[in-house]
């Protein structure tokens, strides 16, 4: 079938910005580290680098490869408040490269260091 | 209490970074419309903006206060095979702006559309 | 020892819902992949799902897929698969299955629960 | 989806006496991990399955060694040397080296 160069083009470019790569998002403190329930951090979230995006077929899953650690420094505050907001330092994950790789082998990896 | 300046305008920076505002996501086009399970598109994910990032309270919710609509022209491929793949053009929802809502607000928001 | 055992099977309408359950025993549940599996009557097997040790992550058969709905409480060392839409071709016993190895297989199975779609 | 061919259908064995079971898979299961992800399963008359063989040739815990497995690639097998009464049942081969993990039609063993 032949198909318009800018149909082709604006499906190529959709491809380009949905690809499977590390990306900015925000991370809930809290819920990342589950921490007990009367604590609480602000800000609330962090910004890192996580993998996302799509793969080009329904077995794979994106997946980082390499990992930094960030440390971040924020308050937290602890509800009786006995004292007042105190700084923490907390280290964050932060994905430098992906792949796309089989949703089995993903859990492989995970489940074989779980496992340990 | 005082609080280091460095410690100030790291903190300051990160609530500036999560803060609610539309943010460039990937979205599963099949998940998006509840499309049958024997059809596929290509690319699978579109790249549109919608709303995240962190609020400042527990009772808040980060949430679209306008929207608009996308065109994007995608390959859809149905299995079997019947034809090659067709294009398609589907409309896409893309939030232009957001703002930090109650969660009670954002349900009667949701449920007064539903009511209709 | 390991121990899995499921209940909420039965009879019910096509279209209807169902929840089976899978309560486990004897290892730590919380560190275990785990599947659920069929068996038509008369016939072999056939995979269905798998979720995470933390439940972060699930993957199913096409032929379930959109339908049902594995998920665990880890807190409660159960597992559980919801299945909606049901069809005369679900109708099987359903075992659920540990992943022992971390490898995406089989360890220990339970003993099944029967259920029967049909009008 | 990879498909696993069993044969024979089934197989009447004299006690004693040794059987094998083959299972042909549409697709390689070595991994690039070095494993092989093929296992063994017997289902006996009422019950559910149990694990006999993992990755090819490894016996699980309380297998007797007269049961063994051997292969690579595409091709497995499964014997037992000496088969005893309490052997006959259902026999599945399945692979999990990639998704839908996928069984073989299975392999009815009896007792003449």
């Known amino acids: 079938a032949h198909y318009n160069t800018e149909i082709l083009k604006s499906i190529d470019n959709e491809w380009r910005k949905t690809q499977c790569m590390p990306r900015e998002v925000c991370i809930d403190v809290g819920k990342e580290f589950g921490v007990a329930t009367n604590t609480f951090f602000k800000p609330p979230c962090v910004s890192v680098y996580r993998c996302g995006g799509c793969c080009n077929s329904e077995g794979l899953q994106c997946m980082n490869t390499s990992t930094s650690y960030l440390s971040k420094t924020l308050f937290e505050i602890t509800v009786p408040l006995s004292q007042g907001p105190k700084p923490v330092t907390i280290s964050f994950a932060n994905h430098t490269s992906c792949r796309c790789m089989s949703k089995l082998d993903v859990y492989r990896q995970v489940h074989s260091i779980i496992r340990r | 209490a005082h609080y280091n300046t460095e410690i100030l305008k790291s903190i300051d920076n990160e609530w500036r970074k999560t803060q609610c505002m539309p943010r460039e996501v990937c979205i599963d086009v099949g998940k998006e419309f509840g499309v049958a399970t024997n059809t596929f598109f290509k690319p699978p994910c579109v790249s549109v903006y919608r709303c995240g990032g962190c609020c400042n309270s527990e009772g808040l919710q980060c949430m679209n206060t306008s929207t608009s609509y996308l065109s994007k022209t995608l390959f859809e491929i149905t299995v079997p095979l019947s034809q090659g793949p067709k294009p398609v053009t589907i409309s896409f929802a893309n939030h232009t702006s957001c703002r930090c809502m109650s969660k009670l607000d954002v349900y009667r928001q949701v449920h007064s559309i539903i009511r209709r | 020892q390991v121990q899995l055992v499921e209940s909420g099977g039965g009879v019910v309408q096509p279209g209807r819902s169902l929840r089976l359950s899978c309560a486990a025993s004897g290892f730590t549940f919380s560190r275990y992949g785990m599947h659920w599996v069929r068996q038509a009557p008369g016939k072999g097997l056939e995979w269905v799902a798998l979720?995470?040790?933390?439940?972060?992550?699930?993957y199913y058969a096409d032929s379930v897929k959109g339908r049902f709905t594995i998920s665990r409480d880890n807190s409660k060392n159960t597992l559980y698969l919801q299945m909606n839409s049901l069809r005369a071709e679900d109708t099987a016993v359903y075992y659920c299955?540990?992943?022992?190895f971390g490898s995406g297989c089989f360890d220990y199975w339970g003993q099944g629960t029967l259920v029967t779609v049909s009008s | 989806d990879i498909v696993m061919t069993q044969t024979p259908l089934s197989l009447s064995v004299t006690p004693g006496q040794p059987a094998s079971i083959s299972c042909k898979s549409s697709q390689s299961l070595l991994h690039s991990d070095g494993k092989t992800y093929l296992y063994w399963h017997l289902q006996k008359p009422g019950q559910p399955p149990q694990l006999l063989i993992y990755e090819v040739s490894h016996r699980f815990s309380g297998v007797p060694d007269r049961f063994s497995g051997s292969g690579s690639g595409t091709d497995f097998t499964l014997k037992i040397s000496r088969v005893e009464a309490e052997d006959v049942g259902l026999y599945y081969c399945v692979q999990s080296i990639q998704l839908p993990l996928t069984f073989g039609g299975g392999t009815k063993v009896e007792i003449k």
């Open positions: 979720i995470w040790y933390d439940g972060s992550n699930k």
């Open positions: 299955a540990r992943d022992g």
